[in-house]
């Protein structure tokens, strides 16, 4: 999906209003310095591409974040403010349902969510030059 036509200001407002708080809740008990940010993004469409990938694609050591509250809200925000996004996700959702696993918060998942927090922060500051 090409995130170029999303309403970035609305997605930012959704993040600041509620998604950010859910990410903090998920990470509660973890020191902010515990993980290094290794994933970066260069502009808002790129940030949303990375956020979608890290939130919804299973990775080694972290089978699925998709059922977490922050993930459900992220999916909803993209569906609302990215035209045509929902339609592209129908097949992906059906595939995900087939391989759904029980929710387990592993250290790898915590690291992944820490990366997500960094991507969201970058998304909210699009005019900053890349380090």
């Amino acid at each position: 999906y090409d995130f170029t036509n999303c309403d970035f200001e609305k997605i930012k407002a959704a993040y600041l209003s509620t998604i950010s708080k859910d990410l903090i809740t998920y990470m509660s008990g973890t020191k902010s310095t515990e993980f290094n940010n290794t994933v970066s993004c260069s502009n808002r469409p790129h940030c949303l591409t990375e956020i979608q990938s890290l939130t919804f694609n299973p990775t080694a050591g972290c089978a699925s974040l998709a059922k977490e509250m922050f993930a459900m809200k992220t999916k909803a925000a993209l569906a609302i403010w990215c035209p045509g996004y929902s339609e592209t996700q129908i097949n992906a959702t059906q595939a995900m349902k087939k391989r759904r696993k029980r929710k387990v918060t592993t250290n790898k998942c915590l690291e992944q969510v820490s990366q997500l927090q960094g991507l969201w922060r970058r998304f909210n500051r699009p005019l900053l030059k890349q380090q």
Epitope: D7, K10, A13, A14, L16, S17, T18, M72, K73, K75, A76, A77, A79, I80, W81, S86
Partner: nanobody, 132 residues
Framework: EVQLLESGGGLVQPGGSLRLSCAAS????????ITWFRQAPGKEREGVAY????????YYADSVKGRFTISSDNSKNTVYLQMNSLRAEDTAVYYC?????????????????????????WGQGTLVTVSS
């Protein structure tokens, strides 16, 4: 030019009723979500009730569930808030606000409808005072 115009506020005794109206113009009413917000003195603006003019889906704040009813008349481009069993704590300025994408995505909007930062258009507000 987009306009939202609230009316129907006033002074009412505890236990009484009022019906607020929000008349809209200047946008495609049937695609939009309209939400009633309220703001009491010294408090943050809070979402009270949401309606999608696209499919009629409604959401309510817990504090008003069972007492307030939101409805829409698409032929008149007007949304109503029927407020029954009013309490002193319902005293506030009531605003209606409109958002263009949450109307056609009402199920996904369950997470976001009550956040004022997401709305494009606002009325000027109408004061509701509940007092004996």
């Amino acid at each position: 030019e987009v306009q939202l115009l609230e009316s129907g506020g006033g002074l009412v005794q505890p236990g009484g009723s009022l019906r607020l109206s929000c008349a809209a113009s200047g946008f495609t009413f049937g695609d939009y979500a309209i939400t009633w917000f309220r703001q009491a003195p010294g408090k943050e603006r809070e979402g009270v009730a949401y309606i999608s003019n696209f499919d009629g889906m409604t959401y309510y704040a817990d504090s008003v569930k069972g007492r307030f009813t939101i409805s829409s008349d698409n032929s008149k481009n007007t949304v109503y808030l029927q407020m029954n069993s009013l309490r002193a704590e319902d005293t506030a300025v009531y605003y209606c606000a409109a958002e263009g994408r949450m109307g056609t995505h009402s199920r996904d909007s369950v997470y976001f409808w009550a956040f004022s930062a997401l709305y494009d258009y606002w009325g000027q507000g109408t004061l509701v005072t509940v007092s004996s």
